[in-house]
Amino acid sequence: APTSSSTKKTQLQLEHLLLDLQMILNGINNYKNPKLTRMLTFKFYMPKKATELKHLQCLEEELGPLEEVLNLAQSKNFHLRPRDLISNIRVIVLELKGSETTFMCEYADETATIVEFLNRWITFCQSIISTLT
């Protein structure tokens, strides 16, 4: 059974991930972002189901494309370079889902824009956090 300290650590990591995803979304939605139209052409794949930490495998598999989209944006829209930002997110995702379990992600048939994709994972973080508190 998870201890209160491990639950607290998980909650903090999820909150960190949530803030990173929200920051990316805010940077993309910035009205001064001249690359938004092109960014919205990138196809992202959504999980069929995202209710547990193991489902973060589906997020991890989309972080490469996410980095490429962020490379399009002006760096001043974000506090960190895309490479560093994605690297930070990868570390958090890996700690949350674990590196040992090889979960096979199942994707929904419909693809999503980067905005829909980020909103989906923001909702996921908020949902898991709410069950921990």
Epitope: F42, K43, E60, G64, P65, S99
Partner: antibody
Framework: QVQLVQSGAEVKKPGATVKISCKVS????????MHWVRQAPGQGLEWIGR????????KYAENFKGRVTITADTSTDTAYMELSSLRSEDTAVYYC????????????????WGQGTLVTVSS | DIVLTQSPATLSLSPGERATLSCQAS??????LSWYQQKPGQAPRLLIY???SLASGIPARFSGSRSGTDFTLTISSLEPEDFAVYYC?????????FGQGTKLEIK
Amino acid sequence: QVQLVQSGAEVKKPGATVKISCKVSGDTITAYYMHWVRQAPGQGLEWIGRIDPDDDSTKYAENFKGRVTITADTSTDTAYMELSSLRSEDTAVYYCTTITFLYSRELRWFAYWGQGTLVTVSS
Amino acid sequence: DIVLTQSPATLSLSPGERATLSCQASQYIGNYLSWYQQKPGQAPRLLIYQATSLASGIPARFSGSRSGTDFTLTISSLEPEDFAVYYCLQHYSTPYTFGQGTKLEIK
């Protein structure tokens, strides 16, 4: 179906510069990140770098920085790879290949390849 | 840079046999690995992407699996046209790196 057609074989002297082309047909080049990979005779594959033809942003492998320039001409749907200060170790087949995030997951990998261009560096 | 180590360097088998090719990453790369087949004088051909997904037009006898940083390409029953060189490639971070290749030859 997307096709990549590369320019013909080249023979160069050490110290010279070579410029190889890769023409995309079946789609517009701006839908793809154009990558270059090389293969020395009897050796494995080595990633050189890539360009986003939509905004000309590039990424290069550290080994090639300062010697390689990847460019793209969107009006002709053609990507170019220029390698300068050639030495005998640059003798290889050079391939262009693509990645895109606009279509299926499969095409996020090196799904389309040119036929290869043999560059021979010899005095 | 991430190093991919393929083994064995050469694999000698007969048609109909099962082939198991290995690729080990020097660090965690998730599922950001693909497999390519290359025949003499030809460009590489994508077989498997995202560690386990079969590329379009590739026969079902090819499959990919992963355990941590160890990746495996399996050919369930070798056909004569399968004898070639196989490379793994990581897309986790630039520079993208390839394994040194495994030559699958007829015994």
